[in-house]
Interface confidence: low
């Protein structure tokens, strides 16, 4: 999937298998990525478990958990609130479209959560308060938390390099691991670029993420998961000056 | 997760053979700040474990059936506004430790936020 | 020494309920949760599910929702368990265990296990 | 239907290794840090052997270990001795869902 970390560098990355995206004191997310298709390097999010641990009098431990065709507007224990603690409307979840769009408020942390499903797969954004992303016990022994630290290396592919080969083949060769898989229905360049136009004029990162989905997969709900991605960036980012990134930062991910 | 080993310490500490701290004592009280210190270095990597969050409640209950001041000779600086998770704190009838913004507003002005997303392939 | 003890073995006719006990020592009940899990005859182990001590918050296996009760008592350091409408596949060892490091993560000390028979 | 799948049987001679299979789906085994083994001697409550798929408790002698690769947590008894015959079972946690599979007896020949 495509990752913008708290430090707004924008990745795309093959983690397959279960990843923390968030690990602090009060809060545990994590992704679990599928191979778009089979043989594929690029991977979507399928499922979605957030921890949000038990705080004082205001919520007890509660976690939510989504998968693909399965968006709850409710937490695994059914509750749609912290609990039966004084301050358990402090966290809340509220369905904004049935099994499509979910909205987790967490005020007692200072944070919102937006889960959605475009298509087949998932998509995360999150507003936090830099204290809260920073309240963790052992940086030293921290391991790899995407959110926070960015993909490993390893697991990056640079799709910018991508769209200087992608009216060529560049498109199949990024994004297979083993021998091109075949695509249903992949798209030329220039109607990939046409309808990721029509949802996304800005050409930024979330434009060419539109686009290198689209040559990847032939899926064209991937534009839409661009599209929304950036809708839920202008509503969680608090810096309108950098609601649209136009270079990937290459640092190492840290 | 090391709180099991936080639990026997707290068990030592507090039942071991040489002079153990009975439970109306300043040392069991020190022991419990030693116990919620422990659970706080611990938290990170104790992430949705029940042992974890049962101790930090325990040590919540215990803390102010016996009347222990939370700050005391081990305890950890804590964040300007927000305790460590599940961190003994007096209780308290309003909701306003439940809302980060009214509790930061206190301290400054407004909190710095950042943002993360994930999405497509 | 952490212990569990489980109450005795159960007759019981099909339709009834039974309600097995096991008893904590030697650690601070509040501080771990406790599963259950059952044998029927020569079979393999099935998760039934969790209760959390300190909390009361309890987790059950799907199929048996509905039928299966997990309560605790903190002032003796007792878990119950409680079935209800038997059946004749009811029939088979309960044991409770301490969650070692959190929900269903591990399950570190057993009961001794109570052996309940369902039969008209 | 367990939907942690282990071998019926495995057997071995004293000395030496045996290892024993428990495949899931990338879910319960695949995605999951947690999964434990436990012993089981006939009669006997069942004994945590290795959890978190490679850790050892106190007292578990060094000859049991675990690893993990793909779907596939595997269970080694290296030097098998005659009191490691038993049943033994995986268990795996990964969201709600917490298993056990079907069982293995190990039989030292």
């Known amino acids: 999937p495509h990752l913008r970390t708290f430090t707004d560098r924008f990745q795309t990355c093959k983690v397959q298998g279960a990843w923390p995206l968030i690990d602090n004191n009060y809060l545990n997310v994590q992704v679990t990525n599928t191979p778009v298709l089979p043989g594929s390097a690029a991977t979507a999010t399928s499922k979605l478990t957030i921890i949000f641990k038990n705080f004082q009098e205001c919520v007890d431990q509660k976690v939510y958990q989504a998968e693909m065709d399965e968006l709850p507007a409710a937490f695994v224990d059914g509750s749609k609130n912290g609990g039966d603690k004084h301050g358990a409307n402090s966290l809340k979840i509220t369905e904004k479209v049935s099994g499509q769009h979910v909205e987790i408020q967490a005020k007692y942390i200072g944070t919102t959560i937006v889960v959605r499903q475009v298509g087949r797969y998932l998509t995360f954004a999150v507003r936090m308060p830099e204290e809260v992303v920073n309240a963790v016990e052992d940086w030293d022994s921290q391991g790899l938390y995407l959110c926070l630290r960015g993909c490993p290396l390893n697991q990056q592919i640079d799709f910018q390099a991508f769209h200087t080969n992608a009216e060529g083949t560049g498109a199949r060769r990024l994004a297979a691991a083993s021998p091109a898989p075949t695509a249903p229905e992949t798209f030329p360049y220039e109607t990939a670029v046409a309808k990721c136009k029509e949802k996304l004029p800005v050409e930024d990162l979330y434009y060419q993420a539109c686009v290198f989905d689209l040559l990847t997969t032939g899926d064209v709900n991937f534009t839409l998961a661009a599209y929304y991605a950036l809708e839920d960036v202008k509503m969680l980012h608090s810096n309108k000056d950098k609601l649209h990134l136009y270079e990937r930062t290459r640092d190492l991910p840290g | 997760c090391k709180i099991l080993k936080c639990n026997s310490e707290f068990w030592s500490a507090t039942s071991g053979s040489h002079a153990p701290a009975s439970d109306d004592t300043p040392e069991f009280c020190a022991a419990l700040r030693s116990y919620a210190l422990c659970t706080r270095r611990t938290a990170r990597t104790c992430r949705g474990d029940l042992a974890y969050h049962s101790a930090v409640h325990g040590i919540e209950d215990l803390m102010s059936q016996h009347n222990c001041s939370k700050d005391g000779p081990t305890s950890q600086p804590r964040l300007r506004t927000l305790p460590p998770a599940g961190d003994s704190q007096e209780r308290s009838d309003s909701p306003e430790i439940c809302h980060y913004e009214k509790s930061f507003h206190k301290h400054s002005a407004t909190p710095n936020y950042t943002h993360c997303g994930l999405f497509g392939d | 020494e952490v212990q569990l003890v489980q109450s005795g073995a159960e007759v019981k006719k099909p339709g009834a309920s039974v309600k097995v006990s096991c008893k904590a020592s030697?650690?601070?009940?509040?501080?771990?949760?406790i599963s259950w899990v059952r044998q029927a005859p020569g079979q393999g182990l099935d998760w039934m599910g969790w209760i959390s001590p300190y909390s009361g918050n309890t987790n059950y296996a799907q199929k048996l929702q509905g039928r299966v009760t997990m309560t605790t008592d903190t002032s003796t350091s007792t878990a119950y368990m409680e079935l209800s409408s038997l059946r004749s596949e009811d029939t088979a060892v309960y044991y409770c265990?301490?969650?070692?490091?959190?929900?269903?993560?591990?399950?570190?000390?057993w009961g001794q296990g109570t052996l309940v028979t369902v039969s008209s | 239907q367990s939907a942690l799948t282990q071998p019926r049987s495995v057997s071995g001679s004293p000395g030496q290794s045996v290892t024993i299979s428990c495949t899931g789906t990338s879910s319960s085994v695949g995605d999951s840090i947690y999964v434990s083994w436990y012993q089981q001697h006939p009669g006997k409550a069942p004994k945590l052997m290795l959890y978190d798929v490679t850790k050892r408790p106190s007292g578990v002698p060094d000859r049991f270990s675990g690893s993990k690769s793909g779907n596939t947590a595997s269970l080694t008894i290296s030097g098998l001795q005659a009191e490691d015959e038993a049943d033994y079972y995986c268990h795996s946690y990964a969201g709600t869902d917490t298993l056990f599979g079907g069982g293995t007896k190990v039989t030292v020949l």
């Open positions: 265990a301490r969650v070692g490091s959190g929900p269903y993560y591990y399950m570190d000390v």
């Open positions: 030697g650690y601070t009940f509040t501080s771990h949760g």
